[in-house]
């Protein structure tokens, strides 16, 4: 087994969002069983959940988590102080805001306390794992007789986020979507006054402050225009 053991001051480098290593073992035993992968997400840079699939263990095991930041002032190994549980077995760790350093390489180590040689280490770029809260306070106003403008707020620095707006009328089978940059404003140039429109927005921490792939939850929808749903043959299918 060709493996690397990472230490808090190791100088290994990787451009991937994570890097998985395991401890070498001398013989086939329980310690050769792979540990589950840890998945971390940083929620609005307010807290971070690092979770793993505890049910993948052959028997219920309270795995332990340690973490540090590579090549930084925060390279001291820290124990998880707030475990998350699934059916009374550890399945994650929650880190608070003061423990999150978005722009330093986060190293997370999962270990089986009954088999200390059985451990796995991953390196994560937290700026690529941020999930913002859903956009709030959606508002619509008319710019002209046929033009609508949609605005919304985010509870994070505006320039760090990009957005996806979806809209449809009660008569549409599917959503129309439009990407919007950090200016968090969307204009619909041609509105049919006879139709009822629904809008919703989600946001992503990309590309100016990080390169996250995951979107926020959708905002609560906002509606505009005539309520023609009584005559709408597609309404029940859309809401199902």
């Amino acid at each position: 087994l060709n493996t690397t053991i990472l230490t808090p001051n190791g100088n290994e480098d990787t451009t991937a969002d994570f890097f998985l290593t395991t401890m070498p073992t001398d013989s086939l035993s329980v310690s050769t069983l792979p540990l589950p992968e840890v998945q971390c997400f940083v929620f609005n840079v307010e807290y971070m959940n690092c979770t793993w699939n505890s049910s993948s263990e052959p028997q219920p095991t309270n795995l332990t988590l340690h973490y540090w930041y590579k090549n930084s002032d925060n390279d001291k190994v820290q124990k998880c102080s707030h475990y998350l549980f699934s059916e009374e077995i550890t399945s994650g760790c929650q880190l608070q805001k003061k423990e999150i350093h978005l722009y330093q390489t986060f190293v997370v180590q999962l270990q089986d306390p009954r088999e200390p040689r059985r451990q796995a280490t991953q390196m994560l770029k937290l700026q690529n794992l941020v999930i913002p809260w859903a956009p709030e306070n959606l508002t619509l106003h008319k710019l002209s007789e046929s033009q609508l403008e949609l605005n919304w707020n985010n509870r994070f620095l505006n320039h760090c986020l990009e957005h996806l707006v979806q809209y449809r009328t009660d008569w549409d089978h599917s959503w129309t979507e439009q990407s919007v940059d950090y200016r968090h404003k969307f204009s619909l140039p041609s509105v049919d006054g006879q139709k009822r429109y629904t809008f919703r927005v989600r946001s992503r921490f990309n590309p100016l402050c990080g390169s996250a792939q995951h979107w926020s939850e959708w905002s609560h929808p906002i509606h505009w225009g005539s309520n023609t749903s009584k005559e709408n043959p597609f309404l029940f299918a859309l809401e199902a």
Epitope: V45, K97, H101, L102, Y103, Q104, Q127, R155
Partner: nanobody
């Protein structure tokens, strides 16, 4: 709503002083890198100063003349500008970044990412 509101700009003679203020709302101020950028007419957006992860950075052109400070209780960041020169003439923008962005990550910025800015004019 996230907002940065600058004030304190104006016209001054070379050698004079100005103090710019920026009041922030809608985000956690003391968890952010706070700083100032400027843009002269026809010029590029230029970093003036920023406090990042406990360190403060200044552009070479303002070192020893400009000082950044902040009052977390008031969610306000200040830029004290002394010994002003005509080449300091620009629109000054207050900037906020996720904590540690500047010292560990970096990247070019456009001045229109933040507020409206405040005009500083220095005449000789």
């Amino acid at each position: 709503q996230v907002q940065l509101q600058e004030s304190g700009g104006g016209s001054v003679q070379a050698g004079g002083s100005l103090r710019l203020s920026c009041t922030a709302s809608g985000f956690t101020f003391d968890d952010s890198d706070m700083g100032w950028y400027r843009q002269a007419p026809g010029g590029e957006c230029e970093l003036v100063t920023i406090s990042s992860d406990g360190s403060t950075y200044y552009a070479d052109s303002v070192k020893g003349r400009f000082t950044i400070s902040q009052d977390n209780a008031k969610n306000t960041v200040y830029l004290q500008m002394n010994s002003l020169k005509p080449e300091d003439t620009a629109v000054y923008y207050c900037a906020a970044e996720p904590r540690g962005y500047y010292s560990n990550y970096g990247g070019r910025r456009e001045c229109n990412y933040w507020g409206q800015g405040t005009q500083v004019t220095v005449s000789s």
